[in-house]
């Protein structure tokens, strides 16, 4: 014997939407199509986000923070789409949104939880402070607080300093590591668990090179296949450290395939570049060319730093003249 009617309790639809700071998102809501559609979107059950009824928007009572930032998919309403298009989300927009939809035959309420993440591309920097050498992994703006891990020669390092400054809506984080006197390779990973986004910085020190004056030097720079994806936009920069600061010798942009060279004695092999080999030559060496040379391959997902130390010694002729 079947009952005349039975009811299954279904909790209010609740969806999680993850947005990225300053980007546009859609808060989804659907309903069984019907006439006399009324749509009210509210934030935290208090603030009016968007109202639509009698065939048009009614935004007189809209909270000012949503002004010019919301719209519906007007051509889709008759098909049961009450989703909200939300422009330029900020961290203050995080929270619970309720969509009330009324028609001639029913009323439904959907809840959407909006979480907002920030992940401005991090950087890995190599710095000299007096006699010390530091690797610094930093991210200018990130939310929520990221997970930062360091590895030395692929082995996790427990020591992990984090300098954190919190602004109104995100964190700025620096994680320095003292690598003075080390020839190991280092890797720093910054992970934003909300956005499921990971960035990796890798630093490799090459063996020192000894060259004579007037000779040329070839410095290798090849990306590690684990990280490198040639389809992704990246930038390659060669720079030389002089008295604690780096000066850029040349750079290459994959998006435009442009090479800009600031040092006339520097040369890049176009064919090698096409094979993702960014090794460079420096001709006609002089004593002032001694120092550290840094190759930086960077994309949104990684930074690969390769450091070469070059010692230029006087040639026999020069020495005998002195």
């Amino acid at each position: 014997i079947f009952p005349l009617a039975f009811f299954i309790y279904v909790p209010m639809n609740e969806q999680i939407v993850i947005g990225r700071l300053d980007e546009d998102i859609i808060l989804p809501s659907s309903f069984e199509r019907g006439s006399e559609v009324v749509i009210h979107w509210k934030y935290q059950d208090s603030y009016k986000v968007h109202s639509y009824y009698k065939g048009s928007d009614h935004l007189e009572s809209q909270d000012p923070r949503y002004a010019n930032r919301t719209s519906l998919f007007y051509n889709e309403i008759q098909n049961g789409n009450a989703s909200l298009f939300f422009r330029r989300v900020s961290l203050l927009d995080e929270g619970i949104y309720t969509c009330y939809v009324g028609t001639a035959i029913q009323v439904i309420t959907n809840k959407v939880v909006l979480k907002v993440g920030v992940f401005l591309t991090p950087v890995m920097k190599y710095e000299k402070r007096n006699t010390n050498s530091f690797l610094i992994c930093s991210v200018l703006s990130v939310y929520p607080r990221p997970i930062i891990t360091w590895k030395m020669d692929n082995t996790p390092i427990s020591e992990n300093n984090m300098e954190e400054t919190g602004s109104l809506d995100s964190f700025s984080i620096n994680s320095p590591l003292n690598i003075t006197g080390s020839n190991s390779s280092y890797e720093c990973t910054i992970e934003n668990s909300l956005l499921k986004q990971t960035w990796t910085g890798r630093w490799t020190m090459k063996d020192g090179l000894h060259k004579m004056q007037s000779e040329h030097v070839s410095l290798s720079c090849q990306p590690v296949n684990d990280y490198f994806s040639p389809n992704q936009d990246f930038k390659v920069t060669w720079s030389r450290m002089k008295s604690g600061t780096f000066s850029v010798l040349a750079y290459y942009l994959s998006s435009s395939q442009n090479t800009i060279i600031n040092e006339s004695r520097f040369s890049w092999n176009k064919e090698l570049i096409n094979q993702s080999d960014f090794s460079m030559n420096l001709m006609d060496l002089n004593l002032s060319d001694s120092g550290e040379y840094l190759c930086n391959i960077s994309s949104d997902e990684y930074t690969l730093l390769t450091i070469h130390t070059v010692h230029v010694e006087p040639s026999q002729e020069t020495a005998s003249h002195n």
Partner: antibody, heavy 121, light 106 residues
Framework: QVQLVESGGGVVQPGRSLRLSCAAS????????LHWVRQAPGRGLEWVAV????????YYADSVKGRFTISRDNSKKSLYLQMNSLRAEDTAVYFC??????????????WGQGTLVTVSS | DIQMTQSPSTLSASVGDRVTITCRAS??????LAWYQQKPGKAPKLLIY???SLESGVPSRFSGSGSGTEFTLTISSLQPDDFATYYC????????FGQGTKLEIK
């Protein structure tokens, strides 16, 4: 089925106050906007006020603005009309009516049976 | 405020007749118009909404038409139960009722 039952009517002197109630059943009270509509003896219908499903918006007819206040208690499934500074012309049967949905539309598929308010000295 | 004017005020008709009641708005109300039927001592009953949509459970002999400022309610074949007072209501801006049309037996 939807049921709306008004109460609180009676005879009151001009200038005095009265509070009407409307008890609802048979639907999810907090999903619907509610209105008060009145009808003077032998006369036509006059819309008085509306309150939205969530209590966020209230609107009034010019004839009662500043004197009447509509309110609701979703936990008690009740609608109220607080009537102050009553006048002879407020004499009418007061109906509680349910909006099609949120209160934003403004027409009434469901009505109560009404309660009579007489303002007389 | 939007004024609603109904005509006629009183209408005499017989069972089986086709009758039409007109409602005029003082300004355009698009199609945001409802029609109600009321019998003495009873609450009004919704017949038509959005000018021409028939409310669930209402007999198909009732129909509505019009948009802008001119609207009509038509009863295609009067039944004994249809003798009552009919009101139009605009809900484009808040709400206003017409003064009513009393439909009586001829």
């Amino acid at each position: 089925q939807v049921q709306l039952v008004e109460s609180g009517g009676g005879v009151v002197q001009p200038g005095r106050s009265l509070r009407l109630s409307c008890a609802a059943s048979g639907f999810t009270f907090s999903d619907y906007g509610l209105h008060w509509v009145r009808q003077a003896p032998g006369r036509g219908l006059e819309w008085v006020a509306v309150i939205w499903y969530d209590g966020s918006e209230e609107y009034y007819a010019d004839s009662v603005k500043g004197r009447f206040t509509i309110s609701r208690d979703n936990s008690k499934k009740s609608l109220y009309l607080q009537m102050n500074s009553l006048r002879a012309e407020d004499t009418a049967v007061y109906f509680c009516a349910r909006d099609r949905n949120s209160g934003a539309l403004g027409y009434f598929p469901h009505w109560g049976q009404g309660t009579l308010v007489t303002v007389s000295s | 405020d939007i004024q609603m004017t109904q005509s006629p005020s009183t209408l005499s008709a017989s069972v089986g007749d086709r009758v039409t009641i007109t409602c005029r708005a003082s300004q355009s109300i698009n199609n945001w118009l409802a029609w109600y039927q009321q019998k003495p001592g009873k609450a009004p009953k919704l017949l038509i909404y959005k000018a021409s949509s028939l409310e669930s459970g209402v007999p198909s002999r009732f129909s509505g038409s019009g948009s802008g400022t001119e609207f009509t309610l038509t009863i295609s074949s009067l039944q004994p139960d249809d003798f009552a007072t009919y009101y139009c209501q605009q809900y484009n801006s808040y709400s206003t009722f017409g003064q009513g049309t009393k439909l009586e037996i001829k």
